[in-house]
């Protein structure tokens, strides 16, 4: 999995008037990292993990850069011609990656009211856009503005590839964004479903990175996909993730079922508690 830095900038307009505030979220290796909120832009590390990477000294730099980017995006929104009444949003998502073989990828995506209308490969400078006429109109509009305003927005729109990679390398150099692995805590709970049936739920929490396999097994053999229900893998606010898988079984059959977990090359299996015992932590490492 490559190292990545992802910027998500959002600006708003109301009744055709671009609002002064904006929102920027930065993800480092898929983790919420910095946040610039609408009223005042302050680079806020999301939890201890980002504190460790940034340190107090670099916050001003992030704040300055993100504020500049927000201004540029507000100017872009102002030049979108089909502003209608009510609330509208322009979003720019920029991603750069450094792969294990040191190759790099960078891209930029624009969304209007949540709909993608323009993408650019920042290495090849190649633009792509969806087929819909609305997207095409918006895309032409924005591209024309970017060309006209090339001097003002040169740093933002043409050096982005280099800037993003430079920042990512700086964060990696700080030594904290090493490929850390945090193993999940897994627990199994049961709840009564209909008469004679129970729902067993296997929850994994506090793990990083986000890739995880969680599934139910009966008599040691994987259950079919359609007999299991999965939750999304979601950030838990601590720089780690959580998810769950559930299935319905006959009461009394608990001893035939185990939850299987695989994460970053580590595996564990977790049994279902019988009877009134509600949670059982597995002895598997």
């Amino acid at each position: 999995e490559p190292h990545s830095l992802r910027y998500n900038l959002t600006v708003l307009s109301w009744d055709g008037s671009v609002q002064s505030g904006f929102l920027t979220e930065v993800h480092l290796d898929g983790q919420p990292f910095l946040r610039c909120d609408r009223q005042k832009c302050r680079a806020k590390p999301q939890g201890q993990w980002a504190e460790d990477v940034l340190g107090n000294k670099t916050w001003d730099r992030e704040t300055r850069d993100l504020t500049g980017n927000g201004k540029d995006l507000r100017m872009t929104l102002a030049h979108i011609k089909d502003q209608k009444e009510g609330l509208h949003s322009l979003q720019e998502i920029r991603v750069c990656e450094i792969h294990e073989d040191n190759s790099t990828r960078s891209s930029q995506h624009f969304y209007y009211d949540g709909e993608l209308f323009l993408s650019q490969n920042l290495e090849t400078k190649e633009w792509t856009m969806p087929q819909s006429s609305r997207a095409q109109t918006l895309a032409m509009n924005v591209r024309n503005f970017l060309k006209e305003d090339a001097m003002k927005t040169k740093t933002h729109y043409h050096a982005m590839h280099a800037d993003c990679l430079q920042e990512l390398r700086r964060y990696l150099k700080s030594g904290v964004v090493l490929r850390r692995t945090v193993p999940p805590m897994v627990n199994v709970t049961r709840s009564e479903a209909s008469e004679g049936n129970i729902t067993v739920t296997c929850r994994a929490s506090g793990f990083y990175p986000w890739n995880i396999t969680l599934s139910w097994r009966q008599d040691g053999v994987s259950l079919s996909h359609d007999t299991q229900q999965w939750g999304d893998v979601l950030p838990d606010g601590n720089g780690t993730y959580q998810t769950w898988v559930a299935t319905r079984i006959c009461q009394g059959e608990e001893q035939r079922f185990t939850c299987y977990m695989e994460h970053s090359g580590n595996h564990s299996t977790h049994p279902v508690p019988s009877g009134k015992v509600l949670v059982l932590q597995s002895h598997w490492q």
Epitope: D219, E254, Q255, T269, P271, G275
Partner: antibody
Framework: QIQLVQSGPELKKSGETVKISCKAF????????MNWVKQAPGKGLKWMGW????????TYADDFKGRFAFSLETSASTAYLQINHLKNEDTATYFC???????????WGQGTTLTVSS | DIQMTQTTSSLSASLGDRVTISCSAS??????LNWYQQKPDGTLKLLIQ???LLHSGVPSRFSGSGSGTEYSLTISNLEPEDIATYFC?????????FGGGTKLEIK
């Protein structure tokens, strides 16, 4: 510490009945089933079946249907194997093993040697 | 029933050797295979589940691999306490069946 402690060696005559016990320590007895495994002298391991320690329902492998019975004394965290109408070919060491997820024998008793003479 | 075959019933090796014990199934078992160790005093222990997952407390010199019908247990650096008989067991289908065992001895 998880432990399964079995009863001592048995010397029986053909036609008699034997009851072997397996007492569990260190875990919640009703959360895991109990397997029984036979090992004839100088031979490999043969799975006899298992008992669900929560419901008490036994499952027997085909070769062990009829004369063999699994039972429980849940309050004492103990599983039992009873063999009726003993035959010479029942001479073996019998192991209980904790049934993890109904696919794995994760903790074993020390074995109970049964000798059947004619 | 699925037949599990351990063709080598006994094996001699020197301390420090790398030893591989094989096990084959009469039909594909999709990695649903466990390994057990039986010491000379009869004590049985789980070593590996699901082809390659080490049970807690098992030394890392033990490893398992395989797929389809062919599986193996490897001891990378033979130690005196590894002298034992090793059994494979499938759980792809009922009844659960074991291999005949491979007895490991010191040269």
């Amino acid at each position: 510490q998880i432990q399964l402690v079995q009863s001592g060696p048995e010397l029986k005559k053909s036609g008699e009945t034997v009851k072997i016990s397996c007492k569990a320590f260190g875990y919640t007895f009703t959360n895991y089933g109990m397997n029984w495994v036979k090992q004839a002298p100088g031979k490999g391991l043969k799975w006899m079946g298992w008992i669900n320690t929560y419901t008490g329902e036994p499952t027997y492998a085909d070769d062990f249907k009829g004369r063999f019975a699994f039972s429980l004394e849940t309050s004492a965290s103990t599983a039992y194997l009873q063999i009726n109408h003993l035959k010479n070919e029942d001479t073996a060491t019998y192991f209980c093993a904790r049934n993890y997820g109904n696919y794995l024998f994760d903790y074993w008793g020390q074995g109970t040697t049964l000798t059947v003479s004619s | 029933d699925i037949q599990m075959t351990q063709t080598t019933s006994s094996l001699s090796a020197s301390l420090g050797d790398r030893v591989t014990i094989s096990c084959s199934a009469s039909q594909g078992i999709s990695n649903y295979l466990n390994w057990y160790q039986q010491k000379p005093d009869g004590t049985l222990k789980l070593l590996i589940q699901y082809t390659s997952l080490l049970h807690s407390g098992v030394p890392s010199r033990f490893s398992g691999s395989g797929s389809g019908t062919e599986y193996s247990l490897t001891i990378s650096n033979l130690e005196p306490e590894d002298i034992a008989t090793y059994f494979c067991q499938q759980y792809s289908k009922f009844p659960r069946t074991f291999g005949g065992g491979t007895k490991l001895e010191i040269k």
